[in-house]
């Protein structure tokens, strides 16, 4: 004969554990049902009655099967330098990530607590290491024979064009100027850009349309300009 299926609450066999999505209640000394994600335990089980679950209250969530008496509070609204990549629902916390041009200066378990603007390298300096989701841009002086004439968080130093006859020699912040209209060899005229860091979580880089409440929360304010490092600007 097949073993009889026990319905919660039930006393487990000595030495055995409760089944999946059940927990052992110490007070009742019974295996009882857990509550599903998006719910919490409103009334704990007894020897004769199972757990009573209730939906999470507004702005709270539970992500796992649980028997917590209260759901967890969602994090604060995302600040203006952030994008909400996951909304607060009954089953998941809000996740805020930094918008393009910013990086996460202070991360939390999921998403970012504090975003800061990516450093911009000033003319004469180029990007040595591009910014990522969690690290700032590193600038370096343009080596002899290269230049950058932009203030940018993505442009690297580019080689000077090579002239038959040089009218004005190039320097770290300016390309060489040739007397003839056609230099013997020229690099591609467009600035060289490094790719912006893209949030791996985000399905989109633009904030999703919101109700009239614009996200701008008290402890999630953008940091001021990043501290000036050599060759960087806080603009």
């Amino acid at each position: 004969l097949p073993a009889q299926v026990a319905f919660t609450p039930y006393a487990p066999e000595p030495g055995s554990t409760c089944r999946l999505r059940e927990y052992y209640d110490q007070t009742a000394q019974m295996c009882c049902s857990k509550c599903s994600p998006g719910q919490h335990a409103k009334v704990f089980c007894t020897k004769t009655s199972d757990t009573v679950c209730d939906s999470c209250e507004d702005s709270t969530y539970t992500q796992l099967w649980n028997w917590v008496p209260e759901c967890l509070s969602c994090g604060s609204r995302c600040s203006s330098d952030q994008v909400e990549t996951q909304a607060c629902t009954r089953e998941q916390n809000r996740i805020c990530t930094c918008r393009p041009g910013w990086y996460c200066a202070l991360s939390k378990q999921e998403g970012c607590r504090l975003c800061a603007p990516l450093r911009k390298c000033r003319p004469g300096f180029g990007v040595a290491r591009p910014g990522t989701e969690t690290s700032d841009v590193v600038c370096k002086p343009c080596a002899p024979g290269t230049f950058s004439n932009t203030t940018s968080s993505t442009d690297i130093c580019r080689p000077h064009q090579i002239c038959n006859v040089v009218a004005i020699p190039g320097n770290a912040s300016m390309d060489a100027v040739c007397t003839s209209t056609s230099p013997t060899r020229s690099m591609a005229p467009g600035a060289v850009h490094l790719p912006q860091p893209v949030s791996t979580r985000s399905q989109h880089t633009q904030p999703t349309p919101e109700p009239s409440t614009a996200p701008s929360t008290s402890f999630l304010l953008p940091m001021g300009p990043s501290p000036p490092a050599e060759g960087s600007t806080g603009d």
Epitope: S59, S73, S76, C88, P211, S212, T217, S218
Partner: antibody, heavy 120, light 108 residues
């Protein structure tokens, strides 16, 4: 754009009941709550209750538990407030307002209000 | 129930004045759950500040909010003619959710 449009003014006799509607447009009704707030003439705002249109779950101020019935019809994106056993002191403007789930109850859009006058 | 008490109940001020309205809760309210509304005569209330200190888009930066626990403040840094209205605080921390009695800001 987001709009909450309420039904027109009502004049009722004591003991009667009234049903006020609030039609929503410009947003998804799924992850919002619809609240009802009343304001007696020259008085402040009083929260009466709220409904989750997706589930029909309601929550009331106990003061209005037996007085007000909240309902909604998602097929026409409309929330309703029915007030029974009307008395002169129920004369007020009744507002519907929405709060998105996850916004900690901030009511970001309001209806224009419905004046209910109870007089014999 | 959590009682919300605003002070003053009314005040007279001139254009350009700095105005401060306080809201005291009878028990502690999480800052995320404290909001302020502005209401003009014959109009529906309008969300002015959410979660203690945050301005919805379109609300001028002369409005600001602060506070924690039981004491919260709404400040208008430089009163403008269109700011003459009644202001309400609102807690959503514990049901039933309650409003302050309102503070009427009038022209001096």
């Amino acid at each position: 754009q987001v709009q909450l449009v309420q039904s027109g003014s009502e004049l009722k006799k004591p003991g009667a009941s009234v049903k006020v509607s609030c039609k929503a447009s410009g947003f998804n009704n799924k992850d919002i709550y619809m609240h009802w707030v009343r304001q007696a003439p020259g008085q402040g705002l009083e929260w009466m209750g709220r409904i989750d249109p997706a589930t029909g779950n309601t929550k009331h101020d106990p003061k209005f538990q037996d007085k007000a019935v909240l309902s909604s019809d998602t097929s026409v994106s409309t929330a309703y407030l029915q007030i029974s056993s009307l008395k002169a002191e129920d004369t007020a403007v009744y507002y519907c307002a929405r709060s998105p789930y996850g916004d900690f109850g901030a009511m970001d859009y309001w209806g224009q209000g419905t004046l209910v006058t109870v007089s014999s | 129930d959590i009682q919300m008490t605003q002070s003053p109940s009314s005040l007279s001020a001139s254009v350009g004045d700095r105005v401060t309205i306080t809201c005291t809760a009878s028990s502690s309210v999480s800052s995320n759950y404290l909001h302020w509304y502005q209401q003009k005569p014959g109009k529906a209330p309008k969300l002015l500040i959410y979660s203690t200190s945050n301005l919805p888009s379109g609300v001028p930066s002369r409005f600001s909010g602060s506070g924690s626990g039981t004491d919260f403040t709404l400040t208008i840094s430089s009163l403008q003619p269109e700011d003459f209205a009644t202001y309400y605080c609102h807690q959503y921390h514990r049901s039933p959710w309650t409003f302050g009695q309102g503070t009427k800001v009038e022209i001096k």
